[in-house]
C-alpha cells in the first residue's frame, strides 16, 4: 500500500478541478499544492467537495498563511468560509465590500452565524464607520442586524434600507432603537396609501410619538393589542379614550385583559372613569368623577 504521506503516482494535482472530488482526504493532503490552491481558489466553490474534503483544503491554506489569509483568497472562499472559526476570521483584514458580499452570500437565508458576526465586526472596524453601502449590504442579508446596532450607529441607516426589514427582525430592538428607526420608516413608506402604510409601519410603531398615534386613530387602522402593548408609554398616555377606541377598533375589547400591564395600566390611571365606562369593558382605576386633574408639568412651564 502507498505510504499515506506520499502522493500516488499520476495523482499530483496540476489544477484544481472536479477530478479532485473523488480523492480521499489523505490524497488531497498529499497531492494538492497549497500555493496552487491559493491561486485557484475561485474554482473551489464550483466543485462539490465534501465538508471533510474542505477541511483538508482549509488546513493547507492555514499552513500557507499562518498569519491570516490575504483578501485575494478570502474573496473566493465560498463554502470553505463555513469551515472557518471566529478565531480564523479575526486574523483577516477585509476591506472590500465585494468580499463581504461574496461571503455573506454563502450563508444567505440562514441565521447569522458566529463566523458571519465576526466577519461583519472585522469589516466594520476595518472601514472605520458604517457607511451607507455597508449598511445596505448588511440589512439586505440580515435585516435583524439593525437591532444589534447602537442608536448612534442606527442614525446613519438610510431609509431605503428599511424596506428590507421584516416584522420579526425588530423583535430584539429596544425602544431607544425604535425611536431612531421609526422616523426613517415613516419617511420610507410615506408614499403608500393608508392600509398599506399601516401594514408596513406597524412593526416600527414602538418609536412613534403621540401625534402620529392620534393621526393613525383617524384612519380606521384596527391596531392589534400586541402592537399597542409595544407602544411607548409616554406616547400612549396623552391619548383620549375616544382616540384609543378608534385606534384599536374591534380590538379595543382586549384592553380588559391587559389592564394591569403597561402601557394600558398607566393610560387607565390618566383617564376619567366616566370616559372609560363608555367602553363598556369594566376598566377600573380611572380618575373619579368630580376630581380636578392638574397637569403639574404645564404649571411648572408657566411659572
Amino acid at each position: 500500500e502507498v505510504e499515506k504521506t506520499a502522493c500516488p503516482s499520476g495523482k499530483k494535482a496540476r489544477e484544481i478541478d472536479e477530478s479532485l472530488i473523488f480523492y480521499k482526504k489523505w490524497e488531497l493532503e498529499a497531492c494538492v499544492d497549497a500555493a496552487l490552491l491559493a491561486t485557484q481558489m475561485d474554482r473551489v466553490n464550483a466543485i462539490p467537495f465534501t465538508y471533510e474534503q474542505l477541511d483538508v483544503l482549509k488546513h493547507k491554506l492555514d499552513e500557507l498563511y499562518p498569519q491570516g489569509y490575504p483578501e485575494s483568497v478570502i474573496q473566493h472562499l465560498g463554502y470553505l468560509f463555513l469551515k472557518m472559526s471566529p478565531e480564523d476570521i479575526r486574523k483577516w483584514n477585509v476591506t472590500s465590500l465585494e468580499t463581504l458580499k461574496a461571503l455573506l452570500e454563502v450563508n444567505k437565508g440562514h441565521e447569522m452565524s458566529p463566523q458571519v458576526a465576526t466577519l461583519i465586526d472585522r469589516f466594520v472596524k476595518g472601514r472605520g464607520q458604517l457607511d451607507k453601502d455597508t449598511l445596505d449590504t448588511l440589512t439586505a442579508f440580515y435585516p435583524g442586524y439593525l437591532c444589534s446596532l447602537s442608536p448612534e450607529e442606527l442614525s446613519s441607516v438610510p431609509p431605503s434600507s428599511i424596506w428590507a426589514v421584516r416584522p420579526q427582525d425588530l423583535d430584539t430592538c429596544d425602544p431607544r432603537q425604535l425611536d431612531v428607526l421609526y422616523p426613517k420608516a415613516r419617511l420610507a413608506f410615506q408614499n403608500m396609501n393608508g392600509s398599506e402604510y399601516f401594514v408596513k409601519i406597524q412593526s416600527f410603531l414602538g418609536g412613534a410619538p403621540t401625534e402620529d398615534l392620534k393621526a393613525l386613530s383617524q384612519q380606521n387602522v384596527s391596531m392589534d393589542l400586541a402592537t399597542f402593548m409595544k407602544l411607548r408609554t409616554d406616547a400612549v398616555l396623552p391619548l383620549t379614550v375616544a382616540e384609543v377606541q378608534k385606534l384599536l377598533g374591534p380590538h379595543v375589547e382586549g384592553l380588559k385583559a391587559e389592564e394591569r400591564h403597561r402601557p394600558v395600566r398607566d393610560w387607565i390611571l390618566r383617564q376619567r372613569q366616566d370616559d372609560l365606562d363608555t367602553l363598556g369593558l369594566g376598566l377600573q382605576g380611572g380618575i373619579p368623577n368630580g376630581y380636578l386633574v392638574l397637569d403639574l408639568s404645564m404649571q411648572e412651564a408657566l411659572s
Epitope: P48, L82, V106, G109, H110
Partner: nanobody, 116 residues
Framework: QVQLVESGGGVVQPGGSLRLSCAAS????????MRWVRQAPGKGLEWVSV??????YYADAVKGRFTISRDNSKNTLYLQMNSLRAEDTAVYYC???????????WGQGTLVTVSS
C-alpha cells in the same frame, strides 16, 4: 436536520440493472450537494457519483454505466446502474451536505449484490 433513506438494492446478475432511490426529508431546502458512495466488503468508502446544482460527476469506474439524477419535487435522489459487474457489489450510501450548518448527512445504506 436532513434524513436520508435509501431503497432499491438487491441481488442482480452481471450485466443487469438496478435503480437505487434516496428519499430526503427535513431541511431539504438547505441541501448543497448529494452523492452516492459505496463500500465494498472489506474496503473503504468510495465516491461513486455526485450531483451539484445541474452538474453531475462520476468516478472513472462507473462512468458510462451509472446515471445520477434528482427529482426536486419528490426530494429524491436516484442512481440508475446498468451493465453491473461483480466489482460493483457493495453497500451503497446516499450522502447530502447542507449550507448553513456545513454538515454531512448519511443514509443507512442499501446492499447491492452482483452475482451469477
Amino acid at each position: 436536520q436532513v434524513q436520508l433513506v435509501e431503497s432499491g438494492g438487491g441481488v442482480v446478475q452481471p450485466g443487469g440493472s438496478l435503480r437505487l432511490s434516496c428519499a430526503a426529508s427535513g431541511s431539504t431546502f438547505s441541501i448543497r450537494a448529494m452523492r452516492w458512495v459505496r463500500q465494498a466488503p472489506g474496503k473503504g468508502l468510495e465516491w461513486v457519483s455526485v450531483i451539484y446544482g445541474s452538474s453531475t460527476y462520476y468516478a472513472d469506474a462507473v462512468k458510462g454505466r451509472f446515471t445520477i439524477s434528482r427529482d426536486n419535487s419528490k426530494n429524491t435522489l436516484y442512481l440508475q446502474m446498468n451493465s453491473l459487474r461483480a466489482e460493483d457489489t457493495a453497500v451503497y450510501y446516499c450522502n447530502a451536505d447542507t449550507i448553513g450548518t456545513a454538515r454531512d448527512y448519511w443514509g443507512q445504506g442499501t446492499l447491492v449484490t452482483v452475482s451469477s
